[in-house]
């Protein structure tokens, strides 16, 4: 097509509205002023313009604003907000939830592509911390973005946010993960009564240290076989057969499916096999009666 | 004049599916979002969802995710609303209406479509 | 998705007086707003958009108010022909929802 640089006698957009999508390419470039379109941004996507007309009113929009759109031409970008590179989007300085929550709409259902991995990178460092709000959006679009967090960024998210997740957000959570979580958790629901407390902070015992896990036992908890095999090792090891009888309740049964998986292979390897018996089970390979345990942890520290 | 002439009234068992058609005339048909509306008996209006007949491009409500599929025949300039396995819920009269870029300011009769053991 | 709240769900009135209806956006909507009719037996038809503006053929006893999340359609002097269903109706994106409808009849 011939380059052709001046609009038509009579094809100047007054207003953004159906009749552009009738207009070659060279035309919207030609006729479509960039300000009439940052104005009725919320227009465009409604308008059932093809992919190569959106490219043009793109190119309009940045020649427009070549340090960056304002927000309130992000709030309305729509499906525009596909074609977006990271490049384009570490221009902008997003700071509304409202913002945010339309343009993760529009790549709603669909993995977290670079662009909306950037814009969140953006709004949150924008925010400074990742607070309750914040969290209550981005999870219910990606559940699993908790997880996709390293430990040090996760050391940025109050205890105040730790509201907002729900237990399927954890469910990719490594145990390094788990660690930084969990202290935050037990912060937030301290002072929920017993019951209710471990409602809460089941989904976070993956990074609880074995003084809880006992503290717990004490509370007829009954926790579930799914939740005990996410338990750190190092916790559970130290757990008398006692402990976790009381812990799981009339989970208890469970162990014996499980004798041959962590963290129960190596918690009953380290249980004298008169006290597993006590729980008559079967549970087989704890240490043979008469024989002297030494904690080999605790000679290193003295030596 | 701008119309929109949708297909006739359907009784259907539930787990079938049902095809409503609803085709256009006296405007470029590719110019415009199909939208589809249903009114359950007594009820308000939901919105399913709208393609883009320039395209075939399509975004559905979430309720509906999985068990709608519009298409369109640019040739005969008709759209198709299709819902997959239905139940005695989806009992309603199906709307298409035309999307302007401020609202759907011309709708179909409606189709009544009746899901029944 | 965003919630339109309207009230109240009936209205009863007598032809002359004047309607008023509200709608109430769970989030900020901007002006991406409408007001449909609809009568007994009959498909709804647009009767405000962008909030404030009467669609072609709308008398101009019918307005509109509001921006953000509050929103008003007022009916200044009910005719016979206005006793119907109105629903209020946002765009946000391409996320549309409507209002659960409120029912204005003769007293």
């Known amino acids: 097509e011939v380059e052709k640089t001046a609009c038509p006698s009579g094809k100047k957009a007054r207003e953004i509205d159906e009749s552009l999508i009738f207009y070659k390419k060279w035309e919207l470039e030609a006729c479509v002023d960039a300000a009439l379109l940052a104005t009725q941004m919320d227009r465009v996507n409604a308008i059932p313009f093809t992919y190569e007309q959106l490219d043009v009113l793109k190119h309009k929009l940045d020649e427009l604003y070549p340090q960056g759109y304002p927000e309130s031409v992000i709030q309305h970008l729509g499906y525009l907000f596909l074609k977006m590179s990271p490049e384009d989007i570490r221009k902008w300085n997003v700071t509304s939830l409202e913002t945010l929550k339309a343009l993760l709409e529009v790549n709603k259902g669909h993995e977290m592509s670079p662009q909306v991995a950037t814009l969140i990178d953006r709004f949150v460092k924008g925010r400074g911390q990742l607070d309750k709000d914040t969290l209550d959006t981005l999870t219910a679009f990606y559940p699993g973005y908790l997880c996709s967090l390293s430990p040090e960024e996760l050391s940025s998210v109050p205890p105040s946010s730790i509201w907002a997740v729900r237990p399927q957000d954890l469910d990719t959570c490594d145990p390094r993960q788990l660690d930084v979580l969990y202290p935050k958790a037990r912060l937030a629901f301290q002072n929920m009564n017993g019951s209710e407390y471990f409602v809460k902070i089941q989904s976070f015992l993956g990074g609880a240290p074995t003084e809880d896990l006992k503290a717990l036992s004490q509370q007829n908890v009954s926790m579930d076989l799914a939740t005990f095999m996410k338990l750190r090792t190092d916790a559970v090891l130290p757990l008398t057969v006692a402990e976790v009888q009381k812990l799981l309740g009339p989970h208890v049964e469970g162990l014996k499916a499980e004798e041959r998986h962590r963290p129960v292979r190596d918690w009953i390897l380290r249980q004298r096999q008169d006290d597993l018996d006590t729980l008559g089970l079967g549970l087989q390979g704890g240490i043979p009666n008469g024989y002297l345990v030494l904690d080999l942890s605790m000679q290193e520290a003295l030596s | 004049q701008v119309q929109l002439q949708q297909s006739g009234a359907e009784v259907k068992k539930p787990g079938a599916s049902v095809k409503v058609s609803c085709k256009a005339s006296g405007y470029t048909f590719t110019g415009y979002y199909m939208h589809w509306v249903r009114q359950a008996p007594g009820q308000g209006l939901e919105w399913m969802g709208r393609i883009n007949p320039n395209s075939g491009g399509t975004n559905y409500a979430q309720k509906f995710q999985g068990r709608v599929t519009m298409t369109r025949d640019t040739s005969i300039s008709t759209a198709y609303m299709e819902l997959s396995r239905l139940r005695s819920e989806d009992t309603a009269v199906y709307y298409c209406?035309?999307?302007?870029?401020?609202?759907?300011?011309?709708w179909g009769q409606g189709t009544m479509v009746t899901v029944s053991s | 998705e965003i919630v339109l709240t309207q009230s109240p769900a009936t209205l009863s009135l007598s032809p002359g007086e004047r309607a008023t209806i509200s709608c109430r956006a769970s989030q900020s909507v901007s002006s991406n707003f409408a007001w449909y009719q609809q009568r007994p037996g009959q498909a709804p038809r647009l009767l405000i958009y962008d909030a404030s503006n009467r669609a072609t053929g709308i008398p101009p006893r019918f307005s509109g108010s509001g921006s953000g999340t509050d929103f008003t359609l007022t009916i200044s002097s009910l005719e016979p022909e206005d006793f119907a269903a109105y629903y209020c109706?946002?765009?946000?994106?391409?996320?549309?929802?409507f209002g659960q409808g409120t029912k204005v009849d003769i007293k």
């Open positions: 109706h946002q765009r946000s994106n391409w996320l549309y929802t």
């Open positions: 209406a035309r999307g302007r870029y401020y609202g759907m300011d011309v």
